[in-house]
Every structure is written in structure tokens, then in C-alpha cells.
């Protein structure tokens, strides 16, 4: 099992068969009349994983996903027929693919689906308490899903439901051309991004949405959208994709005379994830695939983990980049992108920026405006024509923390767990791929926190057939990882300490923060446990100083390889 060597060779490589035989994976292989298990909602409190799929919503027990309840939510035959008449595929498109699944309140979820190219939403009753065991579709209350779910199941929605309002980045039309960021539900008029203006959004593909506080005053709260889109002409020669982070103020209610029912605080910036290449030309990983926010002690400053792939068909690569919110804010406070000059190039705007600065939330903190409807006309005019920032956001340390270019797969998903080890805290990344494998990677600081070494601990095949991993959730409570694909859902423990071997040296060399040698076996490390001695060295993986002679004796060169 155990492989010592270069960091990009997994310490453990486990096939699906090996995962099954060692009881390290539980799979729900889908229903015959469903597929596309792509929309996840984790509820640690109720110990449930809600999954939206084709014509179904599932409620899986986090302890064992073999124990589940299901809601069947298909489309009527008439909707299906209409969809078919519109030239769509009856099996792959003319069904209700669930795209939005969010907690609405203490007792209900809010769900939206494609509805066979006729988006539809409803509420799901889940009861007050886990023991209520309620999981029921409110079939008396359906809502129009336009601007909430895409029409086309191939498209994603990035959504966030807070205080009874749904923020969603999606396509709002049948043709999949009118992409927008919306706010719907709630008591206010729906708000959206400007229509048919490529400066705002240029054929985007939305990844995720997150609420991040800006200050201690909730009036300053912002919603951040992560997406990728076509680069605007002049930003790049030829067709290119750019990864983006967009911001909007939670208390944005649109303009009064201009930008009525449109965002007035929308700004976007480019996310850079690149490595220096030959001839001084950087190799860019521009196709943002997934984002994970690792919360820190300060809720205003989560660490952003992004998974990127290359746009090139020739060069296939993946990377993980980390971003700090302080860098993001610095860019949003920097120069706006402005088109000027003889070639109509993008340049930093040098003129007078109106007050209050576009992108600032109306609040007591930063100025005297109570509502975006009170903003002066020059602010609104400027906001409409300057949605993009000139400076990009560079990753921490100006480079990816991990790249993979020599493999026949690409990264698709990421979740991160912060683990307490004997010698400090470590971030363990679980990275999903397009071939149904999960990579477990630990970031190890070298001299400084900014200088990280990546150690690929495990490569696990979690589905029987190669399939793209399209959803991932991590339960710290259960110490389990949940993985979704077109084919089904898989559940696996975050650690398999016993597999690292039967000796202290092997346990130590593994450098897995979850595991330590307890004197007789390689087992889960608990920082609170008052064990006599726990041998573990994540930073250096040095068994000589951490293992007694008995633990090392005759074991150092006895490694198993699993292929």
C-alpha cells in the first residue's frame, strides 16, 4: 500500500476494489430512473446529506448513506412533451434536474430544478428536530424557477439563501444566453445584473456564492460570486477564459432612476492562478472549477481555495491556488478597469472616482447613505460602466500550492479540513477528479507559512467506473467525506491510519496529520487525548527522531505497492 518517494506520488494508491475490501467506501449506486447526483447540502445538525438529482431529492444518513429517504419530483408528461417538442433529449434534458437545494429556515429546505426546460421551485419540509423524521415535498406550493435554476441541466447555478432571500448566478432563458446574478424570494423586488452588457458578465459559468462579512456591522456584508467567463475583447488576444470573483452588497436594492432593480454595487476582478513558463510566458490555469472557503477565527477573512484547470486542449493541467480576502478587498479598493486610448485598450481609470466609492455598501461604517436608492447619479452612472477592476487578485505566495500536469485527469472539486496535529495545524485537501478519484493532500509549511510543500497522501478510486466527481462535502462531526457524480454518491472516512502499515516508521513517514503511532498501531490522532506518547511528524516525516528502535527495526525498506 505504502509508497515513499516524490511528493507527487501518492503514499497510498487504492483501487475501488481495495477501498471496498478494506471497508473504506460506501456507495449508493443510484436509482435506475435517476442520475446526476450533483447538488449537495450538508446538515451536520440533523446528520443528513441532502442530494438533488434527476427527478429526485435524497436525504442520506451521514453515518451510512445506505440509509436514505427519497422524494420523487418529476415533471408532468405535458412539460416533458413540450421539452421534447423543443428538440431536447427526452432522457438527458426533459426531466427535473435539481440545481438548487438550500436551507430555507429551521423546518424547510428550498429546492429548484430545471423542470424539463421550465424551471420550478418548491419547499421541502424536514421538521423541527432530526427525530421528527420528516422529508416531504410541499406539492401545493410551486414557484417559477426562472432566475433561480437554469433551464439546461448542463449548466450550473451558484446559489446562496440568506434571510429568506435567494442569490443565484444562473442562465435565465431557454437558449442559455441571458446569464445573470439574481436576488429573488423575500419581500423585495427581484434584483439582477445588467442585461446584454458583456462588461458585466460575458457568457459566465457560475461556481459558487458565499456571504463574507466586511466589518462588524452586518450592513456591510457582501455576497461574493465565483465564476469563469469569456475574457472581454481587448483584455486578451484570441478567445480566452478568465476566472473571476464578483461582489455585491447584501443591502443593495438597486438604483432610483438608473439601474432600477439592478445591482449598483456589483464589481468583479480576475483571479490569477499561474506558473512561470518557458520564454517568460506564464502558464495560466484559468478554468475555475470549484471553490472552498476555509473559515478562520476571523469570519471576515476566510482562506479561499480554488481549483483550476487549463483552457488548452494541448496542455492538460490542474492547479490549486489559495487567496486571502485581504488581497481581494485590496483589489476591489484599487483602480477600476476603463477602456481608453487609440486601440480602446483596458487601462486603470485615472479620473475622479465619485463619492461614495462604487462598490461600497450603504451603511454607517463607510458613509452617510442609507440605501443604494439614495446614491448620487454619478455613482450609478460610473458603476454601470465600470463593473470590472483593473488589477487581478494574485494567489498567496503568487503561485499555486499544487499543480498536476503529468496525469490523464483533471481536478474538478475541492474540500479542505483543518487538522490539529502534534506539531501544529494542517490543511488537508480532498480533491475530486474527472476520473472518479479523490486525492488527499496535505499542505506543509516549510520555513514560513507562505512557503508550502504539498504531500500527496492518498489517491482513492471511489466509483466503480471512471466518472467526473461533481460534488463533495466533508463532515467534521462524522469524519467522513461525501462525493457525488452522475452515477451515484460515495462515502469515505477522512483517514485510514491502519493502512499505513504496522510499524511506527511507516506511520511517521506517511505524514498524515490524522494519524499517529500510539505505541502499538497507527491510529487516529486526537490532540486532546492524554496518550503517553504519540509519534507523529508531519513537517519532516522523520521516524528516526520520533520512533523507538523497536518501531523502526527491520521495517524501513519494507513497503507495499498497490496499483
Amino acid at each position: 500500500n505504502y509508497q515513499n518517494g516524490k511528493n507527487n506520488v501518492p503514499r497510498l494508491k487504492l483501487s475501488y476494489k481495495e477501498m471496498l475490501e478494506s471497508n473504506n467506501v460506501i456507495t449508493f449506486n443510484g436509482l435506475a430512473n435517476s442520475s446526476s447526483y450533483h447538488t449537495f447540502l450538508l446538515d451536520e445538525e440533523r446528520s443528513r446529506l441532502y442530494v438533488g438529482a434527476k427527478d429526485h431529492i435524497f436525504s442520506f444518513n451521514l453515518v451510512n448513506i445506505k440509509d436514505f429517504q427519497k422524494i420523487v419530483w418529476p415533471v408532468s408528461y405535458t412539460r416533458r412533451d413540450e421539452c421534447k417538442w423543443a428538440g431536447k433529449d427526452i432522457l438527458k434534458e426533459c426531466a427535473n434536474f435539481i440545481k438548487v437545494l438550500k436551507a430555507y429556515n429551521q423546518t424547510h429546505l428550498y429546492a429548484c430544478g430545471t423542470g424539463a426546460f421550465h424551471p420550478i421551485c418548491t419547499y421541502i419540509e424536514i421538521g423541527h428536530h432530526p427525530e421528527d423524521n420528516i422529508f416531504k415535498l410541499e406539492d401545493s406550493h410551486f414557484e417559477n424557477g426562472r432566475g433561480k435554476s437554469p433551464y439546461d441541466p448542463k449548466l450550473l447555478t451558484a446559489s446562496l439563501l440568506i434571510d429568506g432571500e435567494l442569490y443565484s448566478g444562473t442562465a435565465a432563458d431557454f437558449m442559455g444566453r441571458d446569464f445573470a446574478i439574481f436576488r429573488t424570494l423575500g419581500h423585495h423586488h427581484p434584483i439582477r445584473t445588467e442585461q446584454h452588457d458583456s462588461r458585466w458578465l460575458n457568457d459566465p459559468r457560475f461556481i459558487s456564492a458565499h456571504l463574507i462579512p466586511e466589518s462588524d456591522n452586518p450592513e456591510d456584508d457582501k455576497v461574493y460570486f465565483f465564476f469563469r467567463e469569456n475574457a472581454i475583447d481587448g483584455e486578451h488576444t484570441g478567445k480566452a477564459t478568465h476566472a473571476r470573483i464578483g461582489q455585491i452588497c447584501k443591502n443593495d436594492f438597486g438604483g432610483h432612476r438608473s439601474l432600477v432593480n439592478k445591482w449598483t454595487t456589483f464589481l468583479k476582478a480576475r483571479l490569477i492562478c499561474s506558473v512561470p513558463g518557458p520564454n517568460g510566458i506564464d502558464t495560466h490555469f484559468d478554468e475555475l472549477q470549484d471553490v472552498f472557503l476555509m473559515n478562520s477565527k476571523d469570519p471576515k477573512n476566510p482562506v479561499v481555495y480554488g481549483v483550476f484547470t487549463t483552457s488548452s486542449n494541448i496542455f492538460k493541467g490542474s492547479a490549486v491556488c489559495m487567496y486571502s480576502m485581504s488581497d481581494v478587498r485590496r483589489v476591489f479598493l484599487g483602480p477600476y478597469a476603463h477602456r481608453d486610448g487609440p486601440n480602446y485598450q483596458w487601462v486603470p481609470y485615472q479620473g475622479r472616482v465619485p463619492y461614495p466609492r462604487p462598490g461600497t455598501c450603504p451603511s454607517k461604517t463607510f458613509g452617510g447613505f442609507d440605501s443604494t436608492k439614495d446614491l448620487p447619479d454619478d455613482v450609478i452612472t460610473f458603476a454601470r460602466s465600470h463593473p470590472a477592476m483593473y488589477n487581478p487578485v494574485f494567489p498567496i505566495n503568487n503561485r499555486p500550492i499544487m499543480i498536476k500536469t503529468d496525469v490523464n485527469y483533471q481536478f474538478t472539486q475541492i474540500v479542505v479540513d483543518r487538522v490539529d496535529a502534534e506539531d501544529g495545524q494542517y490543511d488537508v485537501m480532498f480533491i475530486g477528479t474527472d476520473v472518479g478519484t479523490v486525492l488527499k493532500v496535505v499542505s506543509i509549511p516549510k520555513e514560513t507559512w507562505h512557503d508550502l510543500e504539498e504531500v500527496l497522501l492518498e489517491e482513492m478510486t471511489v466509483f466503480r467506473e471512471p466518472t467526473t466527481i461533481s460534488a463533495m462535502e466533508l463532515s467534521t462531526k462524522q469524519q467522513q467525506l461525501y462525493v457525488g457524480s452522475a452515477a451515484g454518491v460515495a462515502q469515505l472516512p477522512l483517514h485510514r491510519c491502519d493502512i499505513y502499515g504496522k510499524a511506527c516508521a511507516e506511520c511517521c513517514l506517511a505524514r498524515d496529520p490524522y494519524c499517529a503511532w500510539d505505541g502499538s498501531s497507527c491510529s487516529r490522532y486526537f490532540p486532546t487525548a492524554k496518550a503517553r506518547t504519540r509519534a507523529q511528524d508531519i513537517r519532516n516525516g522523520d521516524p528516526l527522531t520520533h520512533c523507538s528502535d523497536g518501531g523502526i527495526e527491520g521495517r524501513m525498506d519494507h513497503h507495499h505497492h498497490h496499483h
Epitope: 408532468s76 408528461y77 405535458t78 412539460r79 416533458r80 412533451d81 413540450e82 421534447k84 417538442w85 423543443a86 428538440g87 426546460f117 421550465h118 417559477n144 426562472r146 433551464y151 432563458d173 431557454f174 437558449m175
Partner: antibody, heavy 116, light 111 residues
Framework: EVQLLESGGGLVQTGGSLRLSCAAS????????MSWVRQAPGKGLEWVSW????????YYADSVKGRFTISRDNSKNTLYLQMNSLRAEDTAVYYC?????????WGQGTLVTVSS | QSVLTQPPSASGTPGQRVTISCSGS????????VSWYQQLPGTAPKLLIY???HRPSGVPDRFSGSKSGTSASLAISGLRSEDEADYYC???????????FGGGTKLTVLG
């Protein structure tokens, strides 16, 4: 009660144009696809065109393609059929029909006569 | 020439059972739902049967529809004089990307 009321029919010369309207009530118009079906005097039914509930998709019979345009205004609960380059064989009663996997409700029709 | 083929006429006496056939191909009846429409003299058509065999509310259970392969049929039992009308079958045609009707069957109630 579902009601569909067509208007705009009449006598027109060959090569001329007409715009038919269909006012809908008694159901959520913006939730349903709509269609036009015609019936030449003494003949059977012929499907003409249909439009998706949000105008996202439009389809036409080969006999009218390029000459007729279907549209709708969901804020006014109204369906339209713009007919250009009319021919004698377009003479018919034009029915507006609500689409629900089939034509579940029909208007009373409006007569279009194309004279040469 | 209609894509779906129906007999031009059918007849029966009150109380009798009458069947009207409709034949098509795999691109219409074979792979799509069949509907039947009734058109009383001088009025607009009315939906009689949808999804091969289902009746909308208000349609008497004397009317029934069935489908087998690329053919469909409408049966009217306990024939009444008010059933005298033109009957059309219809289905979506996947290869034409359009809705197709049969030529219609004129039902006469004798006596």
C-alpha cells in the same frame, strides 16, 4: 374558466400581411406554451406554429416558415401571429390553442381570406 | 395528404360502439403521445383524449383511446346523436419537428 379570443382576421390581397392576436384569460398565460392551428374551408386541421412559454423557442410548419412569425407578450396575456407574403392557400380559420402536451383549449377562431 | 391516416367517415346507430383508427409511423405515434379532438359542426375543436388514453375532466367515459405500436384508435360506446362530429387524431412528429393531425373522420349517427 380558460378563454382564448382571436382577432385580426379579414380579407387581404395575395402578398399582403396580417397580424392576428389572441387574448388569453382564466389561466397563468406565462406558464404555458401556445400555438396556432388553421383549418382551410371544408378541410382538416393543420398545425402552424408554437411558442415556448417564455418565447425561448419557436417552431413553424414548413408551409409557413420564413413568412409567419409567432410572438407573445406575457405582460398582456396575448399571443400574436404576424403573417407576411400571404398566399391563396393560407385562406383558413386560424385558431389559437393552449399547449399542454396537446392542445387542451382552443379559441373560436378568426377567418383569414387571401384573394388573388 | 395527412401524415396520420384516418378513415374519412364512420357511422353507427345510437347505442352502438364505433371505433376510429389512426395510423402513423415511429416518428409520431410510435414514440409520442396521441391525442384525439372532437369538432362539432361550426365550432372549434375540443380535446377528447390525451396521452393515448386519458380523458380530460368533463369528457364522458363512453370515449376511450388506445395505442399499439404505430397505430391508435378512438372508441365511442353507447353512441348518441350529439356525438355526430369530425374526429381528429394528433401527435408530435419528431422527424418533422412539428405537430401532425390525421385528415379527420366524419362520424354520422344514423336513424
Amino acid at each position: 374558466e380558460v378563454q382564448l379570443l382571436e382577432s385580426g382576421g379579414g380579407l387581404v390581397q395575395t402578398g399582403g400581411s396580417l397580424r392576428l392576436s389572441c387574448a388569453a384569460s382564466g389561466f397563468t398565460f406565462s406558464d404555458y406554451a401556445m400555438s396556432w392551428v388553421r383549418q382551410a374551408p371544408g378541410k382538416g386541421l393543420e398545425w402552424v406554429s408554437w411558442i415556448y412559454y417564455d418565447s425561448g423557442s419557436k417552431y413553424y410548419a414548413d408551409s409557413v416558415k420564413g413568412r409567419f412569425t409567432i410572438s407573445r407578450d406575457n405582460s398582456k396575456n396575448t399571443l400574436y401571429l404576424q403573417m407576411n407574403s400571404l398566399r391563396a392557400e393560407d385562406t383558413a380559420v386560424y385558431y389559437c390553442a393552449k399547449l399542454n402536451g396537446d392542445f387542451d383549449y382552443w379559441g373560436q377562431g378568426t377567418l383569414v381570406t387571401v384573394s388573388s | 395528404q395527412s401524415v396520420l391516416t384516418q378513415p374519412p367517415s364512420a357511422s353507427g346507430t345510437p347505442g352502438q360502439r364505433v371505433t376510429i383508427s389512426c395510423s402513423g409511423s415511429s416518428s409520431n405515434i410510435g414514440n409520442n403521445d396521441v391525442s384525439w379532438y372532437q369538432q362539432l359542426p361550426g365550432t372549434a375543436p375540443k380535446l377528447l383524449i390525451y396521452a393515448d388514453s386519458h380523458r380530460p375532466s368533463g369528457v364522458p367515459d363512453r370515449f376511450s383511446g388506445s395505442k399499439s405500436g404505430t397505430s391508435a384508435s378512438l372508441a365511442i360506446s353507447g353512441l348518441r346523436s350529439e356525438d355526430e362530429a369530425d374526429y381528429y387524431c394528433g401527435a408530435w412528429d419528431s422527424s418533422l419537428s412539428g405537430y401532425v393531425f390525421g385528415g379527420g373522420t366524419k362520424l354520422t349517427v344514423l336513424g
